[in-house]
Interface confidence: low
């Protein structure tokens, strides 16, 4: 609020820290409910007893943990991004699926396919998606590796998306690639299966283009048909989207102040 | 300043817009002088008559114009980046220089070398550099082209820096690559000539790796020894740095408030 | 967004970016800046109603929260959101200098 | 920077980020957020002296300007600079939901 007398511009009253804390706490109450578009806390009557399901905790932890390559949260777009985003994850189609048979074994690439019906179940409308990240658990790596991510395009061509320089490491580490635009495209199209390719960066005169990095969910030989899936830690898409009912509410209140 | 009575939190007095404007104008007077670390406006006694030199206007225009690939100004680091940065530019060594002879003609790359003594004259200490951009004037382009920028490393190896997807265009357009870290390295080392390479992106299974894009300052054939230099518009490094005298002032006042 | 597109074309009373052109010669009495002659500095002004008040209908409060107090501040304030730099040309003695001043132009505001 | 590293370890009277941990159950009386149990919300507090006043020694003003009124505001205000999101787990009926709330944690403040 504008303070319009000269005196206030340079002097400051004694601050009642407790009062400020209380006001901040009360404002946070409003902030959380308003971000969730809840008029009051949800009823807990139907909450099943016992701890949270493992899958929910895994999803919560995926969201909480900052991972390599993920940028700090960008300045949000004023309206839509103010509101809370529901977080879901869609696991990569398992590597014994026949879709992988179409792509020749290669020392420089691995392939990751996703079922778009699962994506649509999580995000019914492309416009609702606010962020999609491809997350890969990279196992230990002996040498620096420059990798590139591609999106599968029509007629088996591949479109370059982004690249990452991976430093050597003795411990596994999650990698994250922002694939929001791609997933939004997939949600708009009719395809059933869509995919990514992770490749070694090939320079025009370089000879050795082997993908050295091991990604959890593939055997070292990267033969799709022999791959072992290591639990929930195979590649997945982490999706952040406005729930449909919240979006409808937003649509109807599109007027300013 | 914290407003500690409830009343001020929800109500607002009538605003005297003229008073606010006056305060803002006075604050800007202080802001500009303080950013330049000037206690008062500089004397104009020695200023030569007549218009500004062409080179100065060109430099001013380079700074003023937003170019493709240049990000919006990042959130500044509180202290050092508050102060004004002197802007200078260092042009690429002309292509008839013998340094270019060492690099074989290639359809997929062009080379750009810079004289580090010129860089050091502009920025005496690596720590003074706050931003360095490589600027290239890209001529018209018929097809989409994916290009990569490399930095020359010791023993003629090249280190990947970044990439750009160039859309087809009928008109020339300036491209900008952030090369702050690289130029800081060069200023720290003893080398006389340092350089970049701009290459077509080569995918591991792609056959046609020709660099289609024309960069001003090179002939279409990209034969360095035959290159025609189009005036001031050949590739250059745009440098933003804290002037040495201002930095020394900063050093001596490193205490907090 | 409370940016120049919205604020300059509306009569918004609450927090918004306001037009302010500064002519170095006329407004600051300065002849030493050779380029530019002036610039659109703009500024942020307008209340960020606390909205934690009884007389506001609840559903309306909920909708307004993200504009008036999105950061859940104890005393929200109308401040710059997007800022742009300003390059200037001036002389030090006989030598012309081009310098870039960060965060000089206000493009949008927010309640924070 | 007026961040948690500096502000939490100093007795800075001027604009700084202040510690505030919110326990959902104790502070908000809420049992419906299952994870996390609380979070470090923090907040910005402290004056941003106007400093463009005649009684302040000029050279001192110059040195302080970038902290007290870097944006050359008509009334500088202590507001968040760096913010981080907060993921939460709660139930809607029998269904657990994970949602991410943007800009919930204040990491640093600035005079703006």
């Amino acid at each position: 609020d504008y303070k319009d007398d000269d005196d206030k511009l340079s002097t400051s009253k004694t601050i009642d820290m407790e009062l400020v804390k209380r006001k901040r706490i009360e404002a946070i109450r409003g902030q959380i409910l308003s971000k969730l578009r809840l008029a009051s806390p949800p009823s807990q009557g139907e909450v099943p007893p016992g701890p949270l399901p493992e899958a929910v905790l895994a999803l919560y932890n995926s969201t909480r943990d900052r991972v390599a390559g993920e940028s700090a949260e960008p300045e949000p777009e004023p309206e839509a991004d103010y509101y809370a985003k529901e977080v879901t994850r869609v696991l990569m189609v398992e590597t014994h699926n026949e879709i992988y048979d179409k792509f020749k074994q290669s020392t420089h690439s691995i392939y990751m396919f996703f079922n778009t019906s699962e994506l649509r179940e999580a995000v019914p409308e492309p416009v609702l998606l606010s962020r999609a990240e491809l997350r890969l658990l990279r196992l230990k790596l002996k040498v620096e590796q420059h990798v590139e991510l591609y999106q599968k395009y029509s007629n088996n061509s591949w479109r370059y998306l982004s690249n990452r320089l991976l430093a050597p490491s003795d411990s596994p580490e999650w990698l994250s690639f922002d694939v929001t635009g791609v997933v939004r495209q997939w949600l708009s199209r009719g395809g059933e299966i869509e995919g990514f390719r992770l490749s070694a960066h090939c320079s025009c005169d370089s000879k050795d283009n082997t993908l050295q990095v091991d990604i959890n969910g593939f055997t070292t030989g990267r033969r799709g048909d022999l791959a072992t899936i290591h639990g929930m830690n195979r590649p997945f898409l982490l999706l952040m989207a406005t729930p449909l009912e919240r979006a409808q509410h937003l649509q109807s209140s599109r007027h300013r102040r | 300043d914290y407003k500690d009575d409830d009343d001020k939190l929800s109500t607002s007095k009538t605003i005297d817009m003229e008073l606010v404007k006056r305060k803002r104008i006075e604050a800007i007077r202080g802001q500009i002088l303080s950013k330049l670390r000037l206690a008062s406006p500089p004397s104009q006694g020695e200023v030569p008559p007549g218009p500004l030199p062409e080179a100065v206007l060109a430099l001013y225009n380079s700074t003023r114009d937003r170019v493709a690939g240049e990000s919006a100004e990042p959130e500044p680091e509180p202290e050092a980046d508050y102060y004004a940065k002197e802007v200078t530019r260092v042009l690429m060594v002309e292509t008839h220089n013998e340094i270019y002879d060492k690099f074989k003609q290639s359809t997929h790359s062009i080379y750009m070398f810079f004289n580090t003594s010129e860089l050091r004259e502009a920025v005496p200490e690596p720590v003074l550099l706050s931003r360095a951009e490589l600027r290239l004037l890209r001529l018209k382009l018929k097809v989409e082209q994916h290009v990569e920028l490399y930095q020359k490393y010791s023993n003629n190896s090249w280190r990947y820096l970044s990439n750009r997807l160039l859309a087809p265009s009928d008109s020339p357009e300036w491209l900008s690559f952030d090369v702050t870290g690289v130029v800081r390295q060069w200023l720290s080392r003893g080398g006389e000539i340092e350089g970049f390479r701009l290459s077509a992106h080569c995918s591991c299974d792609s056959k046609d790796n020709t660099l289609q894009v024309d960069i001003n300052g090179f002939t279409t054939g990209r034969r360095g020894d035959l290159a025609t230099i189009h005036g001031m518009n050949r590739p250059f490094l745009l440098l933003m740095a804290t002037p040495l005298e201002r930095a020394q002032h900063l050093q001596s006042s490193r205490h907090r408030r | 967004a409370l940016d120049t597109n919205y604020c300059f074309s509306s009569t918004e009373k609450n927090c918004c970016v306001r037009q302010l052109y500064i002519d170095f010669r006329k407004d600051l009495g300065w002849k030493w800046i050779h380029e530019p002659k002036g610039y659109h500095a703009n500024f942020c002004l307008g209340p960020c109603p606390y909205i934690w008040s009884l007389d506001t209908q609840y559903s309306k409060v909920l909708a307004l929260y993200n504009q008036h107090n999105p950061g859940a501040s104890a005393a929200p304030c109308c401040v710059p959101q997007a800022l742009e730099p300003l390059p200037i040309v001036y002389y030090v003695g006989r030598k012309p200098k081009v310098e870039q001043l960060s965060n000089m132009i206000v493009r949008s505001c927010k309640c924070s | 920077a007026l961040d948690t590293n500096y502000c939490f370890s100093s007795t800075e009277k001027n604009c700084c980020v202040r510690q505030l941990y919110i326990d959902f159950r104790k502070d908000l009386g809420w049992k419906w957020i299952h994870e996390p149990k609380g979070y470090h919300a923090n907040f910005c507090l402290g004056p941003c002296p106007y400093i463009w006043s005649l009684d302040t020694q000029y050279s001192k003003v110059l040195a302080l300007y970038n902290q007290h009124n870097p944006g050359a505001s008509a009334a500088p205000c202590c507001v968040p600079q760096a913010l981080e999101p907060l993921p939460i787990v709660y139930y809607v009926g029998r269904k657990p939901k994970v949602e991410q709330l943007s800009n919930m944690i204040v990491r640093s403040c600035k005079c703006s």
Partner: antibody, heavy 122, light 108 residues
């Protein structure tokens, strides 16, 4: 202006049931949380329970077995169903609008009706 | 459930006096306390919520303070219309709403 008018009170025998109504006007009833509170003669206030806009209810532990709160948003009316009444249920029964800004202060009774007296006596 | 212990149960005071009524919660309840005034034959009237926030239209001689377990209602200068019974009330999600027993302020 805001008005809350309780009705349905009177004399009732122990063990019988009674339904109290609270007619609301002057505000958007379906948007508001509502409470029932009672006050035995010459004694203090006792909170019975609360109903949110969606029909979710909270009740005091002592009221859970015998008292039910409901609402009909189309009629702008709040109800309190009281079963198996006892002598100690004799009191003035108030309905009150909860101030429910941001889902918490709805248990602050912002506006009260004048009350209706229920006497449980044989 | 939380207990709210209000004291004193009654007090006598004169016009112009400063009057203080206290309320103690059996467990920490942050600042979730409201205060009401009730005159004979009338419903209660909200004075203060969130321990210290004055309801609009309530004279500024009424003030509230406290957080955690100890709360106070103060009338800085008692006026003739202030003779009434005052109740504190705790509120917290998922718990019952509890009123204090009341404090009757009478004319001395």
């Amino acid at each position: 202006q805001v008005q809350l008018v309780e009705s349905g009170g009177g004399v009732v025998q122990p063990g019988r049931s009674l339904r109290l109504s609270c007619a609301a006007s002057g505000f958007h009833f379906s948007n508001e949380a509502m409470n029932w509170i009672r006050q035995p003669p010459g004694k203090g206030l006792e909170w019975i329970g609360y109903i949110y806009t969606t029909g979710t209810t909270y009740r005091a532990n002592w009221a859970r077995g015998r008292f039910t709160i409901s609402r009909d948003n189309s009629k702008n009316t709040l109800y309190l169903q009281m079963n198996s009444l006892r002598a100690e249920d004799t009191a003035v029964y108030y309905c009150a609008r909860g101030w429910h800004i941001f889902g918490h202060h709805y248990w602050v009774m912002h506006f009260w009706g004048q009350g209706t007296l229920v006497t449980v006596s044989s | 459930d939380i207990q709210m212990t209000q004291s004193p149960s009654s007090l006598s005071a004169s016009v112009g006096d400063r009057v203080t009524i206290t309320c103690q919660a059996s467990q920490r309840i942050s600042t979730y306390v409201a205060w009401y005034q009730q005159k004979p034959g009338q419903p209660p009237k909200l004075l203060i919520y969130a321990a210290s926030t004055l309801e609009s239209g309530v004279p500024s001689r009424f003030s509230g303070s406290g957080s955690g377990t100890d709360f106070t209602l103060t009338i800085s200068s008692l006026q003739p219309e202030d003779f009434a019974t005052y109740y504190c009330q705790s509120y917290s999600d998922g718990d019952s709403v509890i009123f204090g027993q009341g404090t009757k302020v009478e004319i001395k």
